[in-house]
Every structure is written in structure tokens, then in C-alpha cells.
Amino acid sequence: KFSKQSWGLENEALIVRCPRQGKPSYTVDWYYSQTNKSIPTQERNRVFASGQLLKFLPAAVADSGIYTCIVRSPTFNRTGYANVTIYKKQSDCNVPDYLMYSTVSGSEKNSKIYCPTIDLYNWTAPLEWFKNCQALQGSRYRAHKSFLVIDNVMTEDAGDYTCKFIHNENGANYSVTATRSFTVKDEQGFSLFPVIGAPAQNEIKEVEIGKNANLTCSACFGKGTQFLAAVLWQLNGTKITDFGEPRIQQEEGQNQSFSNGLACLDMVLRIADVKEEDLLLQYDCLALNLHGLRRHTVRLSRKNPIDHHS
């Protein structure tokens, strides 16, 4: 429960806070869990403890591991664990998922991107900001204290933002970078009665007996984030799960957002080893949201084998 994941890049500073809180007057001892070896407090060491903080100046890949902190007071001891992973620097621009901090969302009215973990460090303004590895330039971007402000946010502003700053420890400077994703919420979003794009109403789908067949139920519900929208298949008027035919399963497709901003959902019905009796069933694509519910019906017909002449 009192364990925290922390990560950093080799040759950068990393500062980790003990997951157990205590008053500033309480002493905190740090140990490397694997060896139970005490972490020194002398600042001349590359890795040292400073009260509630564990400092890697700079970090090395070999520092990865679990560190134990014990907060000691006159009446109790509290134990916490810091799971530290130090990664090699990537040669390319991509920031892997495991180096990403939590995603933040912004909109036209509110577009602050806070630099993660910066409050642990002794840094001085200004921060440097990068988007998808490119330094941000232009009047739309303003580095303000520990956050970036983007004016007139557009959907194109979504992406991975990296803040870079210098940590100063006793006159020595260490670089720190942190990356998080930024998504743009469309405040002009709306929802409407579901519109089923596929299948067509009363469509006849040709299938081959013994082969596999896929039917896609695709519907759009409006623009922007949609609340309680769903698409699903029904078989002879019941849920697929209630119908109880293991050869017929539905599988969620892609959540789509088209260039026109429409929010759409897909559900794929997979029929394995199509049998004659499948042709007798009625397949209904159901789309529903808070505005209403709409169905389109599909029936299967046997595909006549075509003679192939050379």
C-alpha cells in the first residue's frame, strides 16, 4: 500500500520522496531493500538520503531497485517503499509509455500543463518545454512558473510534452526531464440520436458455409466525449451472451474519432465456422445513448460458389 513507483533517466537527477509522511522533525532512514544496506546521508555520495528525500545525483541504471524508508518518531515507526527504475536514454525521439507521467486534458479555456515532480527539485526558471521532441517556439506558448500555458488550444496541440530543467545541489547542476501526454477536450461537443453507419438497414450479408464471417456494427453519437454510448449485437432478440452459441462472439472494435470530429464506436460480431442454422437467425446491430436507441437488422444468405475459369 505504501509503495510508490519512481523512474528517471541515466545521468539525470532523480529525487524520490518517501511514500510515508511524517513531521519534518521525524528522522527518516533509507535502505536499499535487496541488501538491507543503509543509504548514506553525506552529500558527497552520488546517492544519498536527505530526510524524506532520496537523491540520485546523477542516476545510473544500476540504481534500479526497491528502497525502504522508515519514518521514526518517539512513538511509532512507519515503513514505505520506493520502487525506482532508471532507464537508458533513448537515441530516438520517442518517449516510451513507461517514462510517461499521467495524462492531462486541456481545452480552449484551460490549457495548463504542469511539469511533473518539479516540486521535489531545487530549480530556477525558466523551464524549457518540448512537444514531440521539438522545442516549443511562438507566442502561443508561455512557460509560467512550473507549468506551460498554451493559448487558443486546438486539437493539433495534443501530444507528448517534455519539460526540462536544471536541479542545483551545492553549486552542482544536474539536468532533469519529465514527459506527459496532453489531450484536448472539445468543449463544443454535442451528442445526438445514434446514427448507424453499418450495417445498412435490412442488409443481406453473403457468407460461405464452413468459413468464418465478421459483421461490424458501427454507429456515431455526436462530437467530443460521449457519455453512456454503446453499440452491441443481438441475436434473435437477445444478448449474444444469453444466446449461448460459443461460435458467435462479439468483440469491441476501435473507438473512432473521425476528422469531422464525430465520435463513433464499432462492435464486431465474429461467427466461426458458419453453419446452415446461422442463416435462420436474425442479427441486430443496436446503438444507444442518452438520446435513444436504434437498431439495424442483418440477415445472412448463402454465397453461391462461383466457377473459376482460367
Epitope: N202, G237, T238, G292, R295
Partner: antibody, heavy 118, light 107 residues
């Protein structure tokens, strides 16, 4: 066995609100939609809307949009329908009904008479 | 909204008669149609679902047919307990609309 038990009759003044409950038993409450249907005296059946007890999602007939609220309490397997800004033409018996195959209604509550009168 | 039109609105028949009630949808509803029977002061009772499937416990003299826009409820041999009002309902698109009802009376 499946049972839907509704709350008792209500007399309300125009402009007031009424909240009717429907307690379900004998089946997995979250597995089936619950419909609300009303019937004015001497008239036919009119579909008010539905609630998905699993998610709380609701769909209403356009006529009732903005005036009707449907909620559910999964801990007591009860759904509620609240109708606000009551008018005399809202006088009716209100039924809850469980959804079955083809979204037909296989089990119905006993009905709750709501009378709106000044 | 999908309109459901029932005919006739009322009919008089005798015990043992074959009775047919029709229901027409304003657009195709595939087989998403149910038939209900209602007696005065009582909740409706499901007879037929999916246009032609007989609900469990309902006598076999009741049958349903149709698909798309035209549907029929047939009572093959009318019994004294069958005098009631019958409603069709589509559940293809919301709102799930009912027909106006057909009252079956004793001749």
C-alpha cells in the same frame, strides 16, 4: 419467481412532482432493462422510457424529456421514476415492466395510480 | 418516432370464433414486435414477442406472424377469458411505441 412491486397511489397538485418506486425480486436486477409505461383513464398504453439498472443509463420518450428522471438503487433492486411539473393530463396508472427477449415486457408491476388535481 | 396502427379498434365476436387483429408499423421494425392482452384494472400481459414467439404459459390458440411493417395476432378459437383489449408494441427504435389497442367484445 420474478416480482415487481410498486409504491402506492399518489394524489398531487399541478406543478408538483411525484416519485414512484418499483422493487424487483426473483432475478438478477442489473441484467434487464426496466421500462416505464403509463395509461391514462380509459386510454391506451404510452411508453415513458427505460433505465438500464446496470449502468444507470436512461432513455425517455421526447414528450417527457426534461420532466422525467429515472434512477436505480442496486443495493435494494429498486428503480424510481420521478415526474415533475405535473399537469392534470399526467393523471394515469404508471407501470414498471421488465425487459425480456426482443425488449418485450414479460413481467409488470401492479401499477401506481397518480392523480393530479387542484 | 415509429407509428403503430392497429385495426380494427374494436370487434365483436363469439366464443369459438377465429379472431385476427392487425398492426402496421410506419417503417420496418424487422420482428421487434410484441402483443399484449389487458383486462380492466389489470396490468398488461405478454402474449407474443419477436412477432411470432409464444410467451411461456400462454395458450397455443394465440399466434403471431409478420415481419417488416405488417403483423397479425390470431386467436384460433376465442374463449370467454379472451375478451379484453389487445395492444401491439414495437421495440425496434426508441421510443417503443404502442398501437392504440383493439377491444374484443362479446357479440
Amino acid at each position: 419467481q420474478v416480482q415487481l412491486v410498486q409504491s402506492g397511489a399518489e394524489v398531487k397538485k399541478p406543478g408538483a412532482s411525484v416519485k414512484v418506486s418499483c422493487k424487483a425480486s426473483g432475478y438478477t436486477f442489473t441484467d434487464s432493462f426496466m421500462f416505464w409505461v403509463r395509461q391514462a383513464p380509459g386510454q391506451g398504453l404510452e411508453w415513458v422510457g427505460l433505465i438500464n439498472p446496470g449502468t444507470g443509463a436512461t432513455i425517455f420518450a421526447q414528450k417527457f424529456q426534461g420532466r422525467v428522471t429515472m434512477t436505480r438503487d442496486t443495493s435494494t433492486s429498486t428503480v424510481y421514476m420521478e415526474l415533475s411539473s405535473l399537469r392534470s393530463e399526467d393523471t394515469a396508472v404508471y407501470y414498471c415492466a421488465r425487459s425480456s427477449d426482443y425488449d418485450s415486457s414479460d413481467y409488470w408491476g401492479q401499477g401506481t395510480l397518480v392523480t393530479v388535481s387542484s | 418516432d415509429i407509428q403503430m396502427t392497429q385495426s380494427p379498434s374494436s370487434l365483436s365476436a363469439s366464443v369459438g370464433d377465429r379472431v385476427t387483429i392487425t398492426c402496421r408499423a410506419s417503417q420496418s421494425i424487422s420482428t421487434w414486435l410484441a402483443w399484449y392482452q389487458q383486462k380492466p384494472g389489470k396490468a398488461p400481459k405478454l402474449l407474443i414477442y419477436g412477432a411470432s414467439s409464444l410467451q411461456s404459459g400462454v395458450p397455443s390458440r394465440f399466434s403471431g406472424s409478420g415481419s417488416g411493417t405488417d403483423f397479425t395476432l390470431t386467436i384460433s378459437s376465442l374463449q370467454p377469458e379472451d375478451f379484453a383489449t389487445y395492444y401491439c408494441q414495437q421495440s425496434y427504435n426508441s421510443p417503443y411505441t404502442f398501437g392504440q389497442g383493439t377491444k374484443v367484445e362479446i357479440k
